[in-house]
């Protein structure tokens, strides 16, 4: 149920976009054989993050991690084990 | 009430550590005149994030942003504006 | 495989209206500062990207979702 | 100024026991995968860092909290 294990290359590209470094984005997009027009499109998205600064990257990263670790993604089963985990792992 | 505005340099350093990018960490630590032994210590923490992979960074980032945007940090006032914002910003 | 909720978020970011996208973000994180940021990013992307750009971005996403690395 | 809840989280990460740290994380995000990750990170830091390393990390935090950038 680990979030990034569901599709690691997606998070690789997402965080490269949000990072703002064009060549780091190129590194990630190389892995999926992205064409030049596809890269240009992704760099336009990256420009928006760069223009809006660090706070923008942090907040959108928060949205992505919140969705990724939500019940919708993690499944009901994970939610149901919370109390068990609190009792067992936390030694209460 | 913006989370990173409460202490932007803290989030700068935290996300540099969790990101796994040594350069970003060095840049952040330069801002607070960290010594070499201090940088070495922070890089040991960063190594733990790197060793545990992307999932680890994302999940711990989620914890930090959740705490930072919790009632304990943001105060009651912010929480109370959520419904207003949903009504106004979302044009419902 | 990618989580459907994440896929929906990204699809709306590219092809939805600003209201649709922000409304979807609000289901997960309804903090004013987060929603304001989501709207700013969405407006920026809509202003910067042509229809062809958006098709190319969707094509990248398709490559990501079908990649052995996903 | 840094939020006290954030400061407490970081202090426990460096100076608390694994149980204390995970218990504190659970107050904010009690998902099993999150708590498991918190424990893994805490154990890693405890194994990797000497007492001197931890003092140096706390010194960095002190510099952060007293910085004009905070």
């Amino acid at each position: 149920v680990k979030m990034a294990e569901t599709c690691p290359i997606f998070y690789d590209v997402f965080f490269a976009v949000a990072n703002g470094n064009e060549l780091l984005l190129d590194l990630s997009l190389t892995k999926v054989n992205a064409t030049e027009p596809e890269r240009t499109a992704m760099k336009k998205i990256q420009d928006c993050y760069v223009e809006n600064g660090l706070i923008s990257r942090v907040l959108d990263g928060l949205v992505m991690t919140t969705i990724s670790s939500s019940k919708d993604c993690m499944g009901e089963a994970v939610q149901n084990t919370v109390e068990d985990l609190k009792l067992n792992t936390l030694g209460r | 009430v913006k989370m990173a505005e409460t202490c932007p340099i803290f989030y700068d350093v935290f996300f540099a550590v969790a990101n796994g990018n040594e350069l970003l960490l060095d840049l952040s630590l330069t801002k607070v005149n960290a010594t070499e032994p201090e940088r070495t210590a922070m890089k040991k923490i960063q190594d733990c994030y790197v060793e545990n992979g992307l999932i680890s960074r994302v999940l711990d980032g989620l914890v930090m942003t959740t705490i930072s945007s919790s009632k304990d940090c943001m105060g009651e006032a912010v929480q109370n504006t959520v419904e207003d914002l949903k009504l106004n910003t979302l044009g419902r | 495989e990618i989580c459907p909720a994440v896929k929906r978020d990204v699809d709306l970011f590219l092809t939805g209206t600003p209201d649709e996208y922000v409304e979807q973000v609000a289901q997960y994180k309804a903090l004013p500062v987060v929603l304001e940021n989501a709207r700013i990013l969405k407006n920026c992307v809509d202003a910067k990207m042509t229809e062809e750009d958006k098709e190319n971005a969707l094509s990248v996403l398709d490559k990501i979702y079908t990649s052995p690395l996903c | 100024e840094i939020c006290p809840a954030v400061k407490r989280d970081v202090d426990l990460f460096l100076t608390g026991t694994p149980d204390e740290y995970v218990e504190q994380v659970a107050q904010y995000k009690a998902l099993p995968v999150v708590l498991e990750n918190a424990r893994i990170l805490k154990n890693c830091v405890d194994a990797k860092m000497t007492e001197e390393d931890k003092e140096n990390a706390l010194s960095v935090l002190d510099k952060i909290y007293t910085s004009p950038l905070c």
Partner: antibody, heavy 120, light 107 residues
């Protein structure tokens, strides 16, 4: 750290093609980025392209698009660069280099270089 | 393309001296900068990355610094093995480019 062993010197005629190899060992090839770089005698370096060994995906310097073609053979952990329509301006030493870092941005481990001479 | 301008193009120094080489980028490269040493007839060797992080096995007499568009490499107490050519290189936008090089010779 690993090793990068490049093929021997080449003397070729203008208009011909050449295929250079870079055999690697001592690291996980499938998760590596390998770049190729050009250096004329007494001059600086020029990045040509990189390849991600895991998928064969490539990124090129626009100046070398259509000129250089990068491939890998995972079974032998070898990277190749096919250089076509050679001119005297292509005479140079060509290096392969493995990327390093988090993220893998830096050209850290280099082959010994292959001298290519283009002459009629 | 981001242009990297290195100076000086060449310099002479004696063993034990301290020298500084500078590199100017035509745009902000946000510290994504590396320095390489290349001895005669050899492959380049990575010395510094992230503008100031020493690569494995590089002696501490080498140090990198800078930010934005201005960067420098300082070599303290020059040793005989330090003579050769030095190059800076950015990793910000495509293509990653190198400076023209600085040839460091024995006085």
């Amino acid at each position: 750290q690993g090793q990068m062993q490049q093929s021997g010197a080449e003397l070729v005629k203008p208009g011909a093609s050449v295929k250079l190899s870079c055999k690697t060992s001592g690291f996980t090839f499938s998760s590596s980025y390998i770049s190729w770089l050009k250096q004329k005698p007494g001059q600086s370096l020029e990045w040509i392209a990189w390849i991600y060994a895991g998928t064969g995906g490539t990124t090129y310097n626009q100046r070398f698009t259509g000129k250089a073609q990068l491939t890998v053979d995972s079974s032998s952990s070898t990277a190749y660069m096919h250089f076509s329509s050679l001119t005297t301006d292509d005479s140079a030493i060509y290096y392969c280099a493995r990327h390093y870092g988090n993220p893998p941005a830096w050209f850290a481990y280099w082959g010994q270089g292959t001298l290519v001479t283009v002459s009629a | 393309d981001i242009q990297m301008t290195q100076s000086p193009a060449s310099l002479s120094a004696s063993v034990g001296e301290t020298v500084t080489i500078t590199c100017r980028a035509s745009g902000n490269i946000h510290n994504y900068l590396a320095w390489f040493q290349q001895r005669q007839g050899k492959s380049p060797q990575l010395l510094v990355y992230n503008a100031e992080t020493l690569a494995d096995g590089v002696p501490s007499r080498f140090s990198g610094s800078g930010s934005g568009t201005q960067y420098s490499l300082k070599i303290s107490s020059l040793q005989p093995e330090d003579f050769g050519s030095y190059f800076c290189q950015h990793f910000w936008s495509r293509p990653p480019t190198f400076g023209g090089g600085t040839k460091l010779e024995i006085k």
